[in-house]
């Protein structure tokens, strides 16, 4: 048994890191394999992850950490049975991937002007929290080409728009991701999408 | 909410040894890490050792290795330290601090336990 | 080992002021900077650890700043309850080490 991809691990900087890789062949996770990770400090303790499957030969583990600060270091040891089959470390802050925004809103009832909410993933005492910037994709149920992404730069978690930007009469979606430039982070997932039906007063033409 | 319970104040004899009692409210003892801090009037306070009571590792004060011994009964979650050949410099506030396992920083005190060391 | 300094032993303020405690460590801790409050009861509390991160149930007119070998606790406004002695202490490297502490008084 043998690794055929390293394990590589990111941290939403809250409470969980999660490792992905892959074995040279079919592989029971769960039952064959244990993934120790221990933080790099005084009087520290090793704790066992119990991986899943993630494909035929894919493995993947979600590390449980009470809290993260940006020097922490983990040492992660990768076994099967009594054999060390991969030693390696990891810095959660090096590594970041945030958790992806909830709770998306249009409200529609704002004088021709959409307004889509979210909620920020993480709460008030998490570093991340006042340094997370968004992009809200918005597309069409009916016509592909017609999508499009707004860059929410500031830190508040909403969007305005004009629904005359989009067309009116049909359906749309919208999801939200974050991603934080102070730790170079990756792009969380998308959240949810959520639906609605785009119409508004078409403003009578002036001749 | 946490709480550590100290035993209480000692009077002791210079020579001898004290031993003290932290008691925890949690409800295992495994990924924590019991720490000892010793507080005077003239040295401020000073860190004399820590214990991961889960797997009996411990680290020690060069200045109180020897003489400081932390140990734990984990079925009670009670940490305790023996304080052996007394002098008067030991007549102290001893603090016990629980903190989670591997961080620097001590989020959890104990009231203190007053030990004099007189003739 | 590492020497913590608080310059300051003792400091008067008023309610309602903006008070700032500074420690300075003998070489670059690395943010391992923690802040405690120690009331006249003996009684002591964490409110800051890793220089900035408010401990929970700590009210948020404490903060802390800092890098490298110099650090801050603020109070932003000032509040009877906050009258203790104010100790740092760096976690970078063993023994873990305190400041002589700052007593907080009402002017």
């Known amino acids: 048994m043998k690794v055929l991809q390293e394990p590589t691990c990111v941290s939403d900087y809250m409470s969980i890191s999660t490792c992905e890789w892959k074995m040279n062949g079919p592989t029971n996770c769960s039952t064959e394999l244990r993934l120790l990770y221990q933080l790099v400090f005084l009087l520290s303790e090793a704790h066992t992850c119990i991986p899943e499957n993630n494909g035929g030969a894919g493995c993947v583990c979600h590390l449980l950490m009470d809290d993260v600060v940006s020097a922490d270091n983990y040492t992660l040891d990768l076994w099967a049975g009594q054999q060390l089959l991969w030693k390696g470390s990891f810095k959660p802050s090096e590594h970041v991937k945030p958790r992806a925004p909830g709770n998306l809103t249009v409200h529609t009832n704002v004088s021709d002007t959409l307004l889509l909410t979210w909620s920020n993933p993480y709460p008030p005492d998490n570093y991340l929290y006042n340094h997370l910037t968004y992009a809200v994709n918005i597309w069409s149920e009916n016509d592909p080409a017609d999508f499009r992404i707004y860059n929410v730069t500031y830190l508040e978690p909403s969007l305005r728009i004009a629904a005359s930007t989009l067309k009116s009469g049909i359906s749309y979606r919208a999801r939200v991701r974050a991603w934080a430039q102070c730790y170079n982070t990756t792009w969380s997932e998308w959240s949810p999408s959520t639906k609605w039906h785009n119409s508004y007063r078409e403003p009578f033409e002036q001749h | 909410q946490v709480q550590l319970q100290q035993s209480g104040t000692e009077l002791v004899k210079p020579g001898a040894s004290v031993k003290m009692s932290c008691k925890a409210s949690v409800n295992t003892f495994t990924g924590y890490n019991m720490h000892w801090i010793k507080q005077t009037p003239g040295q401020g306070l000073e860190w004399i050792g820590g214990?991961?009571?889960?797997?009996?590792?411990?680290s020690y004060n060069q200045k109180f290795k020897g003489r400081a011994t932390l140990t734990a009964d984990k079925s009670s979650n009670t940490a305790y330290m023996q304080l052996s050949s007394l002098t008067s410099e030991d007549s102290a506030v001893y603090y016990c601090?629980?903190?989670?396992?591997?961080?620097?920083?001590?989020?959890?005190w104990g009231q203190g336990t007053l030990v004099t060391v007189s003739a | 080992d590492i020497q913590m300094t608080q310059t300051t032993s003792s400091l008067s303020a008023s309610l309602g002021d903006r008070v700032t405690i500074s420690c300075r460590a003998s070489q670059d801790i690395s943010n391992y900077l923690n802040w405690y409050q120690q009331k006249p009861d003996g009684t002591v509390k964490l409110l800051i650890y890793?220089?900035?991160r408010l401990h929970s149930g700590v009210p948020s007119r404490f903060s802390g700043s800092g890098s490298g070998t110099d650090y801050s606790l603020t109070i932003s406004n000032l509040e009877q309850e906050d009258i203790a002695t104010y100790f740092c202490q760096q976690g970078n490297t063993l023994p873990p080490t305190f400041g002589g502490g700052t007593k907080l008084e009402i002017k």
């Open positions: 890793y220089t900035s």
């Open positions: 601090a629980l903190t989670t396992a591997g961080r620097a920083w001590f989020p959890y």
């Open positions: 214990l991961h009571p889960g797997n009996g590792d411990s």
